[in-house]
């Protein structure tokens, strides 16, 4: 009973996600995956947020498009940068 | 422990805005995101929007975008929910709920006790 | 965004017994990010499994959650006064976040 992850016409077997757990590509919106020794990574690319970089970021005044602030901003930018 | 403790009750007239507060303790609060949900009356639970505390960014979901606004103030450890231009509809429990920023733990694992905002002329 | 369907919306059981509650996407959801939630009239939801099938902290073992994609089961494998609620499911994977409608538990 062997699982596999369809990703980009690409079959990624479990073996492989556990060698490589940045693999599947988890990160959203062109969010960078590090592995880290206590799990995945997201570094979100700019005007993205959250843990899988899934959230647009909105600026006051609640404009529909994503702010743009430079640079590449983890998800959790206390803990991993 | 983790608490999450929310502001009371308001009543509201249609047009106007309210302000709902959630002060977090047992916890450092800018290691963690802060999302607002509401449930209307009977069930269903709807997303609204989630802040980061450590720089202040902030999403909306679409439906409240230019109707929302998520605030917070690191000195108290407190985040804020204003929703503008109230309508009936926006009758409901509104929780706070605490999430991880570790990647698979981005669920709402503290969650507030709720604020009931009546809305109603 | 990925709507999400719960079924039974209600279901009746006797304690003792084995409770199957279903969750659906419309669409794959990421990373088998789907947590399920418990609440009580009220009170707020309280997380149950996340990540599909992890039990959250201080969670009986008599809760399990399985399933991958856009398919997944909440199963109670010995139901007790207690665990007669609603329950909703909820992913956190896409934005925005999304739950499903909920299903009753209620005692037959």
């Known amino acids: 009973d062997h699982h596999h992850h369809h990703h980009e016409q690409k079959l990624i077997s479990e073996e492989d996600l556990r060698a490589d757990p940045c693999a599947a590509r988890p990160c959203a919106h062109g969010g960078r995956c590090y592995a880290h020794f206590s799990g995945l990574v997201c570094a979100c690319a700019p005007g993205y947020m959250g843990a899988r970089c899934e959230f647009p970021v909105h600026p006051d005044g609640a404009s529909a498009l994503p702010a743009a602030p430079p640079g590449l901003r983890p998800g959790d930018p206390q803990r991993y940068l | 422990q983790v608490q999450l403790v929310q502001s009371g009750a308001e009543v509201k007239k249609p047009g106007a805005s309210v302000k709902v507060s959630c002060k977090a303790s047992?916890?450092?609060?800018?290691?963690?995101?802060m999302h607002w949900v509401r449930q209307a009356p009977g069930p269903g639970l709807e997303w609204m929007g989630i802040?980061?505390?450590?720089?202040?960014?902030?999403s909306y979901a679409q439906k409240f975008l230019g109707r929302v606004t998520i605030a917070r103030d690191t000195s108290t450890s407190t985040v804020f929910l204003d929703l503008y231009s109230l309508r009936s509809e926006d009758t409901a429990v509104y929780f706070c709920?605490?999430?991880?920023?570790?990647?698979?733990?981005?669920?709402?694992?503290?969650w507030g006790q709720g604020t009931l905002v009546t809305v109603s002329s | 965004e990925i709507v999400l369907t719960q079924s039974p919306g209600t279901l009746s059981l006797s304690p003792g017994e084995r409770a199957t509650l279903s969750c659906r996407a419309s669409?794959?959801?990421?990373?088998?990010?789907l947590v399920w939630y418990q609440q009580k009239p009220g009170q707020a939801p309280r997380p149950l499994i996340y990540?599909?099938?992890t039990r959250a902290s201080g969670i009986p073992d008599r809760f399990s959650g399985s399933g991958s994609g856009a398919d997944f089961t909440l199963t109670i494998s010995r139901l007790e006064p207690e665990d007669f609620a609603l329950y909703y499911c909820?992913?956190?994977?896409?934005?925005?976040?999304?739950f499903g409608q909920g299903t009753t538990l209620e005692i037959k």
């Open positions: 802040i980061d505390p450590s720089v202040g960014s902030k």
């Open positions: 669409q794959s959801v990421s990373s088998n990010f």
């Open positions: 709920a605490r999430a991880g920023k570790r990647f698979g733990e981005s669920y709402f694992d503290y």
């Open positions: 990540g599909a099938s």
């Open positions: 047992g916890n450092t609060f800018t290691n963690y995101y």
């Open positions: 909820q992913q956190y994977g896409d934005s925005p976040y999304t």
